[in-house]
């Protein structure tokens, strides 16, 4: 990000780890939905977790806002909340379901599963 | 979002506000920007905030892999973080700045103003 | 190479309730879809519902309010239950295997050899 | 549910000669969603063909199948005395799954 450069390097002081990938296992089951899913019945979606603290790291991909949030928040936590780790990147995953007319449907759903991390 | 019309209608107890856009003023001399920004010296960012409940209303335009997460976070927070606030749709601004080699430059910056907000 | 052995009483009285097992062997049962099928003597094939190894089910509708399909992965078995049976649910009861990827699905391979079970008082 | 109907319900033929079994649907099956397979006095059934032209594994080329929607097609190119059997269809494009009524190929 263009402003990215401007942000300083004042280091952090919270060793809870920064934004980046975790798993998450999805059970279809357990979220009820197989009664209309086939396959798969489970799969690894991952989810973003962490601090984004400043300054913002160039592989997190802030945005221009996000430099400027992350700045603030820096210089005034309380006036200014932080920015937040999210998928910046998602990949799809076909699924075979059975449809509302009971017909089995194999179909690509978009953003199911998080392929990398950012502050935003 | 496909995956949206098959969260349920568990109504929220959170009396929090929900994901909505709120005000962040931007003061480039308060972050000592000053000495390279000529103009705007200041402006309205916005920015994010608020809870990300199950269920995601559409107007929050949940990815799927965030439906998923979501529910998923509302029948065990504990093992699965709630999805985030975080903006959706973003403007540029122009702005006229001094570069290296003291020239004054007209440049439009991206990604600077909040439109949006959802959960993520 | 998988194989599959159906096992339960050759006989129960109408009104009862059929219950069958089927071992699954050289194979984990998880990751596939386990299916029950009968077929009465003489007649065709009737699907009557499967199981996935995390307890997902689905059955045939007019069978569904009698019927229960369950599964123990710790003894790689899976099991039916036909409640309230009558002559008519006389059959040759048989266990098979569907692959549950999206790219192979909604076929049985292999098939148990069947079972005979007679409903008779 | 989709219902299959096969004909002839019974085929009379020699060894050598080539068998054509039809099975019809009462809709249309999604992706060409069928199996067939055979069966012999006293066994179970055995999967010849899925996805309405794929062999399964270990069959012999000289079955084949055909077809789409709601037509399909199982030929048998030059009869074996072991291919004579009951030969069932069965879609997996709508649930519930359904099992043709059968076609009987029998030694003319």
């Known amino acids: 990000a263009p402003l990215a450069t401007r942000q300083g390097k004042r280091p952090s002081k919270n060793l809870k780890a920064r934004c980046s990938r975790k798993a998450l296992h999805v059970n279809f089951k357990d979220m009820g939905w197989d009664d209309w899913i086939i396959a798969p019945l489970e799969y690894e979606a991952f989810h973003c977790e962490g601090l984004c603290e400043f300054p913002l790291r160039s592989h997190l991909e802030p945005t221009n806002h996000a430099v400027i949030q992350t700045l603030m928040n820096s210089m005034d936590p309380e006036s200014t909340p932080p920015t937040c780790c999210v998928p910046t990147r998602l990949s799809p995953i076909s699924i075979l379901f059975i449809d509302s007319a009971n017909n089995v449907v194999y179909k690509q759903y978009e953003d199911m599963v998080v392929e990398s991390c950012g502050c935003r | 979002a496909p995956l949206a019309t098959r969260q349920g209608k568990r109504p929220s107890k959170n009396l929090k506000a929900r994901c909505s856009r709120k005000a962040l003023h931007v003061n480039f001399k308060d972050m000592g920007w000053d000495d390279w920004i000529i103009a705007p010296l200041e402006y309205e960012a916005f920015h994010c905030e608020g809870l990300c409940e199950f269920p995601l209303r559409s107007h929050l335009e949940p990815t799927n892999h965030a439906v998923i997460q979501t529910l998923m976070n509302s029948m065990d927070p504990e093992s699965t973080p709630p999805t985030c606030c975080v903006p959706t749709r973003l403007s540029p601004i122009s702005i006229l700045f001094i570069d290296s080699a003291n020239n004054v430059v007209y440049k439009q910056y991206e990604d600077m103003v909040v439109e949006s907000c959802g959960c993520r | 190479q998988v194989q599959l052995q159906e096992s339960g009483p050759g006989l129960v009285k109408p009104s009862e309730t059929l219950s069958l097992t089927c071992t699954v062997s050289?194979?984990?049962?998880?990751?596939?879809?386990w299916s029950w099928i009968r077929q009465p003597p003489g007649k065709g094939l009737e699907w009557i519902g499967y199981i996935y190894y995390s307890g997902s089910t689905r059955y045939n509708p007019p069978l569904k309010s009698r019927v229960t399909i369950s599964v123990d992965t710790s003894k790689n078995q899976f099991s039916l239950k036909l409640s309230s049976v009558t002559a008519a649910d006389t059959a040759v009861y048989y266990c098979?295997?569907?692959?549950?990827?999206?790219?192979?699905?909604?076929?049985?391979?292999?098939w148990g050899q069947g079972t005979l079970v007679t409903v008779s008082s | 549910e989709i219902v299959l109907t096969q004909s002839p319900g019974t085929l009379s033929l020699s060894p050598g000669e080539r068998a054509t079994l039809s099975c019809r649907a009462s809709?249309?099956?999604?992706?060409?969603?069928l199996a067939w397979y055979q069966q012999k006095p006293g066994q179970a059934p055995r999967l010849l063909i899925y996805g309405a032209s794929s062999r399964a594994t270990g069959i012999p080329d000289r079955f084949s199948g055909s077809g789409s929607g709601t037509d399909f097609t199982l030929t048998i190119s030059r009869l074996e005395p072991e291919d004579f059997a009951v030969y069932y269809c069965q879609q997996y494009g709508s649930s519930p799954l359904t099992f043709g009524g059968g076609t009987k190929v029998e030694i003319k």
């Open positions: 050289g194979d984990s049962i998880s990751s596939y879809y």
């Open positions: 809709q249309s099956v999604s992706s060409s969603y």
């Open positions: 098979a295997r569907i692959c549950s990827s999206t790219s192979c699905w909604g076929w049985f391979d292999p």
